[in-house]
Amino acid sequence: GELETSDVVTVVLGQDAKLPCFYRGDSGEQVGQVAWARADAGEGAQELALLHSKYGLHVSPAYEGRVEQPPPPRNPLDGSVLLRNAVQADEGEYECRVSTFPAGSFQARLRLRVLVPPLPSLNPGPALEEGQGLTLAASCTAEGSPAPSVTWDTEVKGTTSSRSFKHSRSAAVTSEFHLVPSRSMNGQPLTCVVSHPGLLQDQRITHILHVSFLAEASVRGLEDQNLWHVGREGAMLKCLSEGQPPPSYNWTRLDGPLPSGVRVDGDTLGFPPLTTEHSGIYVCHVSNEFSSRDSQVTVDVLDPQEDSGKQVDLVSAS
């Protein structure tokens, strides 16, 4: 006869591990007892349990309540046991010794591998700003046994670097994702993907990129000079910019206070019926936490009484 077992039994932390040991004997052969022991114990073999054909199962005190026989029906040639609630300390070599009649004794070894699934964490890097060089966008760390695999899934162009720290029974892997920030990356997902044999499927943690920037400012509304004449209603100037975080807008007049009746509504400057007093240099000031921009325009309100053309100068400053 011979013993049937598995070379390696793999179980996830906290699950039950079946330690198989089956005697394939000739007709009429009987199994008297099966002894299970930890074969890699420092100070010699550590007994787990003894299965006796007549007296049943005896579990050693160290494993009391954790080692069981299979539920019935049981093949009398089956010396398998169940190790409940596997912990990392259970990882190692196990031996089953089977005493048979009349063939004698047989022994077999197996290795129990306890997988510790990782609990990954993602840490965003420092605030990203347009104009920076290569910058840390995020780092992702996962610790498990065996060492997990940490990769990145993103449309964003960047570079990755990984490092690993080995502990006594596990390994921590940290991967960093670096990029050169640009406004096109705003709102783009950066996903850390952790793979491990103890996970049914990859674990994914997504970080949304935020890149601070502020676009050049410009003013719209003066495209048709002939519209800016005395008496015209509904005239307005609109300040154009974009940024992250979204910018705030402020309007001033360079050559004095804003004329009465002129309304400031965020990025828009609304005029009452135009008079020559509305002529002047208007400045749109755009700012966010990252930067500020200015754009100024000269408004020249045409008085039909005078026979002079309207002059418009556009000046942009940062």
């Epitope: 049937e4 077992t5 598995s6 039994v9 079946k18 198989p20 089956f22 394939r24 299979p70 539920p71 019935p72 029906p73 093949n75 009398p76 040639l77």
Partner: antibody, heavy 123, light 107 residues
Framework: QVQLQQPGAELVMPGASVKMSCKAS????????MHWVKQRPGQGLEWIGA????????SYNQKFKGKATLTVDESSSTAYMQLSSLTSEDSAVYYC?????????WGYGMDNWGQGTSVTVSS | DIQMTQTTSSLSASLGDRVTISCRAS??????LNWYQQKPDGTVKLLIY???RLHSGVPSRFSGSGSGTDYSLTISNLEQEDIATYFC?????????FGGGTKLEIK
């Protein structure tokens, strides 16, 4: 996928025997035990016994010893149950069911069942 | 033999209800308790094994609990397809024995 195929019905005379089959597919036949369960019309379920398909070791409910005989044919991945000396009490649906006690798995529930064979004992 | 008792032989409930079916063993069965579903056409499926472990492919609205001699099966949000008879079964001691079944119907 795992399938256990059983013939739909058997009509037999009182006192005779019947041998019903359960053909397994979709898995390694000898890795699992095969159990047999009886259900009389409108009644509950009764465990008849089981066979370790790897070496034909059998375990019976005492109530069915002498009535049921379990065998397997590894080459065709088929389990059989023979019922002898049939009476009207044996008229029932008989199910075969796979039991997950393998090298790796622990046997808990019967995870796949056949559709059942309806046996009618009547003259 | 260990006797398995399902006190409720039939149960009427509405779609969306939370339904609990109980099962009592005549002696401690060490959590070796399984639940099966039998559809009207005779098809039998394993739902829960070892008291509370969900068999693969079984919807998560099914759950099991208990210990010692008292066990229960809960369907958290009853659906039309759950109309069936439910059996408990102990696998701790030979011979394996089943409860008498609880037939679940829609109100």
């Amino acid at each position: 996928q795992v399938q256990l195929q059983q013939p739909g019905a058997e009509l037999v005379m009182p006192g005779a025997s019947v041998k019903m089959s359960c053909k397994a597919s979709g898995y390694t036949f000898t890795d699992y035990w095969m159990h047999w369960v009886k259900q009389r019309p409108g009644q509950g379920l009764e465990w008849i016994g089981a066979i370790d398909t790897s070496d034909s070791y059998t375990s019976y409910n005492q109530k069915f010893k002498g009535k049921a005989t379990l065998t397997v044919d590894e080459s065709s991945s088929t389990a059989y149950m023979q019922l002898s000396s049939l009476t009207s009490e044996d008229s029932a649906v008989y199910y075969c069911a796979r039991w997950g006690s393998t090298m790796i798995t622990w046997g808990y529930g019967m995870d796949n069942w056949g559709q059942g064979t309806s046996v009618t004992v009547s003259s | 033999d260990i006797q398995m008792t399902q006190t409720t032989s039939s149960l009427s409930a509405s779609l969306g209800d939370r339904v609990t079916i109980s099962c009592r063993a005549s002696q401690d069965i060490n959590n070796y308790l399984n639940w099966y579903q039998q559809k009207p056409d005779g098809t039998v499926k394993l739902l829960i094994y070892y008291t509370s472990r969900l068999h693969s492919g079984v919807p998560s609205r099914f759950s099991g609990s208990g210990s010692g001699t008292d066990y229960s099966l809960t369907i958290s949000n009853l659906e039309q397809e759950d109309i069936a008879t439910y059996f408990c079964q102990q696998g701790n001691t030979l011979p394996w024995t089943f409860g008498g079944g609880t037939k679940l119907e829609i109100k």
